[in-house]
């Protein structure tokens, strides 16, 4: 089956700047600003565009060693990024893949809203574990706040 979870979160960072940092250069930034959440990101194949496969490794003590993500779409003019978790982590006997969509929307106050959709593609009749959805959401929030803090502290970065 397919189980869809949608969330929204806000940031004080303007949409264009946040997209550059969080999406377009996140693979470089995450291990630097949130080493407690992500230890490394490496491209397995591709140059960053659609079809690219990347391996995200987690620090010691995490329940999973790594996940592999596939880049599905990067729309840098509309601040949209689609990717799928295709291997490692929770992917296995009951879960086929997780398709994720992130859209960053500018707000009138100069900040932004992140609209996030996570589609869990389960095998057969299996359901999604609530703790997995919660862990995924917490990871996203951790990375976002770490990037946000970095940008607030480094006013020249990603302008």
């Amino acid at each position: 089956g397919v189980f869809n979870y949608e969330t929204e979160t806000t940031s004080v960072i303007p949409a264009a700047r946040l997209f550059k940092a969080f999406i377009l250069d996140g693979d470089n930034l995450f291990p630097k600003v949130a080493p407690q959440a992500i230890s490394s990101v490496e491209n397995i194949e591709g140059n960053g565009g659609p079809g690219t496969i990347k391996k995200i490794s987690f620090p010691e003590g995490f329940p999973f060693k790594y996940v592999k993500d596939r880049v599905d779409e990067v729309d840098h003019t509309n601040f949209k990024y689609n990717y799928s978790v295709i291997e490692g982590g929770p992917i296995g006997d009951t879960l086929e893949k997780i398709s994720n969509e992130i859209k960053i929307v500018a707000t009138p106050d100069g900040g932004s809203i992140l609209k996030i959709s996570n589609k869990y593609h389960t095998k057969g009749d299996h359901e999604v574990k609530a703790e997995q959805v919660k862990a995924s959401k917490e990871m996203g929030e951790t990375l976002l706040r770490a990037v946000e803090s970095y940008l607030l502290a480094h006013s020249d970065a990603y302008n």
Epitope: G26, L29, G48, H76, T77, S155, Y158
Partner: antibody
Framework: EVELVVSGGGLVQPGGSLRLSCAAS????????MTWVRQAPGKGLEWVAN????????YYVDSVKGRFTISRDNAKNSLYLQMNSLRAEDMAVYYC??????????????????WGQGTTVTVSS | DIVMTQSPLSLPVIPGEPASISCRSS???????????LDWYLQKPGQSPQLLIY???NRASGVPDRFSGSGSGTDFTLKISRVEAEDVGIYYC?????????FGPGTKVDIK
């Protein structure tokens, strides 16, 4: 506000040399391709040269190949244009401009979205 | 090299009225990523050029929504829905599909 400040223009004799500088402020140069564009008196805009974010690739308009060199010092957040064997037809206002963004996901183009104020190069004997 | 042409080369306008500038390239600017590598720039008198539209139709940050870009392949248009006095200057299209960027000759817009 992000800004590019151009300097180094002046009067030079035919066959002489000049080095233009473009200092970036409020953004990190190493994330961007950079470009030089010029405008001869009373004429339109002409692209001169591009340099990749890491300085490993350079491109030039045919008329300046072998005479001009674009370079960058990311540590100093600065872009340069070394102009040798200057000719009368090189006389123009020279602008630097910021090109596409380069990050882990590759190269993404947002137009030449930041321009310097320009510096005048006069070639005359 | 890709050759860019613009028409008209001179455009007298009336404030509050719409205006349109055409740009044509000698080969298609549509890239495999679905984007048209065509920008529009405005150079106001005595100033540096400023970006209006990038990749054919995307308005740059801070550009008023009266400016819009359209077209695909080899034919492009810049439209100003209601001209304001501050819009006078020379408008250039530029291709960035090939690394040897090329500008159009420019369209001079002034108040009639």
């Amino acid at each position: 506000e992000v800004e590019l400040v151009v300097s180094g223009g002046g009067l030079v004799q035919p066959g002489g040399s000049l080095r233009l500088s473009c200092a970036a402020s409020r953004f990190i140069l190493s994330h961007y391709w950079m470009t030089w564009v010029r405008q001869a008196p009373g004429k339109g805009l002409e692209w001169v040269a591009n340099i990749k974010q890491d300085g490993r690739e350079e491109y030039y308009v045919d008329s300046v190949k072998g005479r001009f060199t674009i370079s960058r010092d990311n540590a100093k957040n600065s872009l340069y244009l070394q102009m040798n064997s200057l000719r009368a037809e090189d006389m123009a206002v020279y602008y630097c401009a910021r090109g596409g963004f380069w990050g882990a996901m590759g190269y993404y183009y947002y137009g030449l979205d930041v321009w310097g104020q320009g510096t005048t190069v006069t070639v005359s004997s | 090299d890709i050759v860019m042409t613009q028409s008209p080369l001179s455009l007298p306008v009336i404030p509050g009225e719409p205006a349109s500038i055409s740009c044509r390239s000698s080969q298609s600017l549509l890239q495999s990523d679905g984007h048209n590598y065509l920008d529009w720039y405005l150079q106001k008198p005595g100033q540096s050029p400023q970006l209006l539209i990038y990749l054919g139709s995307n308005r740059a940050s801070g550009v008023p929504d009266r400016f819009s870009g359209s077209g695909s392949g080899t034919d492009f248009t810049l439209k100003i829905s209601r001209v304001e006095a501050e819009d006078v200057g020379i408008y250039y299209c530029m291709q960035t599909l090939q690394t040897g960027f090329t500008f159009g000759p420019g369209t001079k817009v002034d108040i009639k």
